[in-house]
């Protein structure tokens, strides 16, 4: 609450997060032309990335393009990309939607369709929908431990969200345990009025707000965090503005002396930890 | 503008960026002692890294040291590093400029020069100039979509820079389209009075400032972002303070049971998105 | 100092860091059943990661789990994980402490102990102590160059911590060179009253605070940074809240057409650069 006689100072904050959980993923795997069900286990080293600062990312879905090589090939026949003759293909042209540079030739993509040939990582990425339900939908049960150290330098005051009295096997609950700093990802979404299973398909950004409203006067000292949650990406966003949250990364390798890569389009939840508040003192 | 009767509150912000573009790179490639021109395509998975928060990086140039192995070898004969006898080489010494630990021996680097032998990733990185012009100079035509969600918790007000009415094929222009949040990298540099082609060689840091000056009173409500651009690294910086922007990373692999790595010195532009401003309400 | 007649504005900041140093690591290496002492060199590409923003990480210790494959195996017999019959093992169960999903069978881990079989990356990670002393304890002698560009947009004022007059071979010292922005990691810890050798074992978080108290009035202009250091992680933290600072990452590869990974549990120091302060002008 506003105490006008106090000197207010904004919080200086440092955050450290630790995600826990294992996901079992079942997907169709094609090997030697034969498709069968494959089961795999994903642990933290597989679904998170060593990231600093006030964000962490949990992969909830993915699309793989395996064994890509730098060469020439027909581009993917997405809407408006088909051709019937070379006239439709412009040598040196880079369509922002495409994944390569056109050679100027119109070539067969499959039995029925022709597209412009491109110099690219081939075969080019298929523009297929993200798997539904999400492959790592069980990430809903993962937990994250959030450690937050705060400082009011002008008041020479430091504290943190985890106190020695806290129990390391707690789980945050708005009513029953509002000071516990271990959060189940599904609960974060529920608190924000969002459906984890749905968001996991395309990805999204979730804000975890930590509000410190600190009264540092000795006679009425109070300085504990209040947690709240809200979705930060726009779920109603137009296709052209790239809804959800995803990024591409590659694993490079050599096979028979040929440089290859596996391209992974990773969908997931980026959690942004937004720390704010003030420390007031007479 | 300052309305003294208003209660002002700093902005809480979350940013999401998405880079688009393809670069064709032409460089000399040596294989089996034969040097020839090599062409390769770089897409987002090749020139960006999955990075969080208010920064994104676009690689514009690089120097590769391929096939390095942990062993003994002569260090690179940079200025002041040559020797004529073992006396000049101190066993166990790590010169901050060097890439290894000296063995104490002065050995031939080539026909005419001798340097101290080091235990290092060998052959040690040659201290050669970054290629000029930059290998990915065409990154000037890449675009970045910036999504910015802001919040004034005290006023319980949230908004974002992308409105439903916006057109996903727009490009930002200071005069014609100042609310479009898709930016051509070259335009950002032009607005900041900088030369992309030049900065791309050594790398640099570019600030994209998003200023929210929000009047949240219902009778004169206004809350839209204003974009501006300025270079953040010091282009006149002394050599000793490492001008430009680069970092080294490695790709590790095994060949004939020998652990090897390719070291990449990546030069590029780090874009920092600096969001600031206040929300005022009576 | 507070000048009440001045209009104060918070600092907008951008940070760029560059770590230098080489570590020689000696550890036991087992090959073909034979254990011998192995020496290796770690340079910046080996112990840091290309990270953005106001943080950088230096790996000071690690534990490797090499050649893991996705299959079935007994889980690690940590406290409370042993079993004597299948009744103790629940098919489909994921213990948050475990590294896999139980199959429901109780199987031999070694001659004397049985544990629940799991579907996981096998063999599962051994829960062994971080090596003591830390493998990269010599990181104490690494240095970091910190470049900080600041801006007070309301006052249209920009400056940086590195001035043209500065000497690139300086090292920060609180008394003798308080404006030098090249810091020896060991000195940072000493200034913060911490023992680098000790913290290097489990890792930790160290804050480098840069305080700008700027008087921008022309008649008494002053705007230089003041550096201070404090440890941000809680050294007295309970085991259950994961003391220190570590994360796991993996290097994936194929061997005889089998997908494998090496899991690295990296311990180290995350340095958070916390920039704050105000610019005041009449």
């Amino acid at each position: 609450s506003d105490k006008l006689y106090q000197r207010k100072e904004p919080v200086i904050s440092s955050v450290h997060t630790k995600v826990k959980g294992i996901a079992e993923v079942t997907e169709n795997v094609t090997e030697g032309g034969v498709t069968k069900l494959g089961h795999s286990i994903f642990d933290t080293a597989d679904y998170t990335f060593p990231l600093q600062g006030n964000s962490f990312f949990v992969m909830t879905n993915y699309v793989k393009s395996e064994g890509q090589v730098q060469t020439l090939c027909p581009e993917y026949p997405r809407r408006g990309a088909q051709c019937s003759s070379d006239r439709r293909c412009k040598k040196g042209w880079m369509d922002p939607q495409s994944k390569g540079i056109q050679t100027g030739r119109c070539v067969p993509y499959d039995k029925t369709r022709k597209t412009c040939e491109v110099s690219a990582w081939c075969p080019t990425e298929e523009e297929k929908e993200a798997p539904r339900p999400a492959l790592l939908r069980s990430a809903e049960n993962f937990t994250v431990l959030i450690k937050n150290n705060i400082h009011f330098p002008g008041h020479n005051y430091t504290t943190r969200n985890i106190l020695p009295t806290m129990n390391g096997s707690c789980t945050f609950h708005k009513t029953w345990d509002p000071q516990c700093s271990i959060f189940r990802l599904g609960d974060i979404f529920q608190e924000a009025g969002e459906n984890f299973t749905e968001v996991a398909v395309q990805g999204g950004i979730m804000g975890i707000e930590i509000y410190w409203d600190c009264n540092l006067d000795s006679w009425s000292h109070h300085c504990r965090p209040r947690y709240s949650f809200r979705r930060l990406d726009d779920k109603n966003m137009d296709e052209s503005f790239v809804p959800g949250y995803n990024f591409r990364y590659a694993k490079y390798y050599k096979e028979n002396n040929v440089e290859k890569r596996t391209l992974i389009k990773a969908f997931g939840i980026r959690f942004d930890i937004l720390v704010f508040g003030t420390g007031g003192k007479f | 503008s300052d309305k003294l009767y208003q209660r002002k509150e700093p902005v809480i912000s979350s940013v999401h960026t998405k880079v688009k573009g393809i670069a064709e790179v032409t460089e000399n490639v040596t294989e089996g002692g034969v040097t020839k021109l090599g062409h390769s395509i770089f897409d987002t998975a090749d020139y960006t890294f999955p990075l969080q928060g208010n920064s994104f990086f676009v690689m514009t140039n690089y120097v590769k040291s391929e096939g390095q192995v942990q062993t003994l070898c002569p260090e690179y004969p940079r200025r002041g590093a040559q020797c004529s006898s073992d006396r000049r080489c101190k066993k166990g010494w790590m010169d901050p400029q060097s890439k290894g630990i000296q063995t104490g021996r002065c050995v031939p680097y080539d026909k005419t020069r001798k340097t101290c032998e080091v235990s290092a990733w060998c052959p040690t990185e040659e201290e050669k100039e970054a290629p000029r012009p930059a290998l990915l100079r065409s990154a000037e035509n890449f675009t970045v979509l910036i999504k910015n969600n802001i919040h004034f918790p005290g006023h319980n007000y949230t908004t974002r820079n992308i409105l439903p009415t916006m057109n996903g094929s727009c490009t930002f222009h200071k005069t014609w389209d100042p609310q479009c949040s898709i930016f051509r990298l070259g335009d950002i540099f032009q607005e900041a009075g900088e030369n992309f082609t030049e900065v791309a060689v050594q790398g640099g840091i570019m600030g994209i400032e998003i200023y929210w000056d929000c009047n949240l009173d219902s009778w004169s409500h206004h809350c839209r972002p204003r974009y501006s651009f300025r270079r953040l690294d010091d282009k006149n910086m002394d050599e000793s303070f490492v001008p430009g922007y680069n970092f080294r990373y490695a790709k590790y692999y095994k060949e004939n049971n020998v652990e090897k790595r390719t070291l990449i010195k990546a030069f590029g532009i780090r874009f920092d998105i600096l969001v600031f401003g206040t929300g005022g309400k009576f | 100092s507070d000048k009440l007649y001045q209009r104060k504005e918070p600092v907008i900041s951008s940070v760029h860091t560059k770590v230098k140093g080489i570590a020689e690591v000696t550890e036991n290496v087992t090959e073909g059943g034979v254990t011998k002492l192995g020496h290796s060199i770690f340079d910046t590409a080996d112990y840091t990661f290309p990270l953005q923003g106001n943080s950088f990480f230096v790996m000071t210790n690690y534990v490797k789990s090499e050649g893991q494959v996705q299959t079935l195996c007994p889980e690690y017999p940590r406290r409370g994980a042993q079993c004597s019959s299948d009744r103790r093992c629940k098919k489909g169960w994921m213990d948050p402490q475990s590294k896999g999903i139980q199959t429901g069978r109780c199987v031999p881990y070694d001659k004397t102990r049985k544990t629940c079989e799991v579907s996981a990356w096998c063999p599962t990670e051994e829960e062994k102590e971080a090596p003591r002393p830390a493998l990269l304890r010599s990181a104490e002698n690494f240095t970091v160059l910190i470049k900080n560009n600041i801006h007070f947009p309301g006052h249209n004022y920009t400056t940086r911590n590195i001035l043209p007059t500065m000497n690139g071979s300086c090292t920060f010292h609180k008394t003798w060179d308080p404006q030098c922005s090249i810091f020896r990691l060991g000195d940072i810890f000493q200034e913060a009253g911490e023992n680098f050798t000790e913290v290097a074992v489990q890792g930790g978080i160290m804050g480098i605070e840069i305080y700008w108290d700027c008087n921008l009035d022309s008649w008494s202009h002053h705007c230089r940074p003041r550096y201070s250091f404090r440890r941000l992680d809680d050294k007295n933290m309970d085991e259950s809240f994961v003391p220190g600072y570590n994360f796991r990452y993996a290097k994936y590869y194929k061997e005889n057409n089998v997908e494998k990974r090496t899991l690295i549990k990296a311990f180290g120091i995350r340095f958070d650069i916390l920039v704050f302060g105000t610019g005041g002008k009449f």
Epitope: - | G67, V69, T71, L72, C73, Y109, K111, C122, P123 | -
Partner: nanobody
Framework: EVQLVESGGGLVQAGGSLRLSCAAS?????MGWFRQAPGKEREFVAG????????RYADSVKGRLTISRDNAKNTVSLQMSGLKPEDTAIYYC???????????WGQGTQVTVSS
């Protein structure tokens, strides 16, 4: 460019010995030997750093082949004993920047091991 001249090849019985020599036109940090059997790729055999430190051998020849160097003369030799028919190949001398990295090769000398 470094000029390399090999000598000492020839025909030898299985179990026999042979000594290959190589002279370089200029001093170089590392010198080594590679071989190429008919229809196969060229493979590393042995390498030596300056003054014979460090030395490195392919697993298939360890204990049977010994590399030695004379820095003053810019020469390297390969003492081969306990030869097997599978050692039959053209043997190339090479120079480089470490015992793993070679840039220049000689013309080669033929070694034939008969059973």
């Amino acid at each position: 460019e470094v000029q390399l001249v090999e000598s000492g090849g020839g025909l030898v019985q299985a179990g026999g010995s042979l000594r290959l020599s190589c002279a370089a036109s200029e001093r170089t940090y590392s010198m080594g030997w590679f071989r190429q059997a008919p229809g196969k790729e060229r493979e590393f055999v042995a390498g030596s750093g300056w003054d014979g430190i460090p030395t490195r051998y392919a697993d298939s020849v360890k204990g049977r082949l010994t590399i030695s160097r004379d820095n003053a003369k810019n020469t390297v030799s390969l003492q081969m004993s306990g030869l097997k028919p599978e050692d039959t190949a053209i043997y190339y001398c090479a120079t480089g920047t470490s015992v793993y990295h070679y840039q220049y090769w000689g013309q080669g000398t033929q070694v034939t091991v008969s059973s």
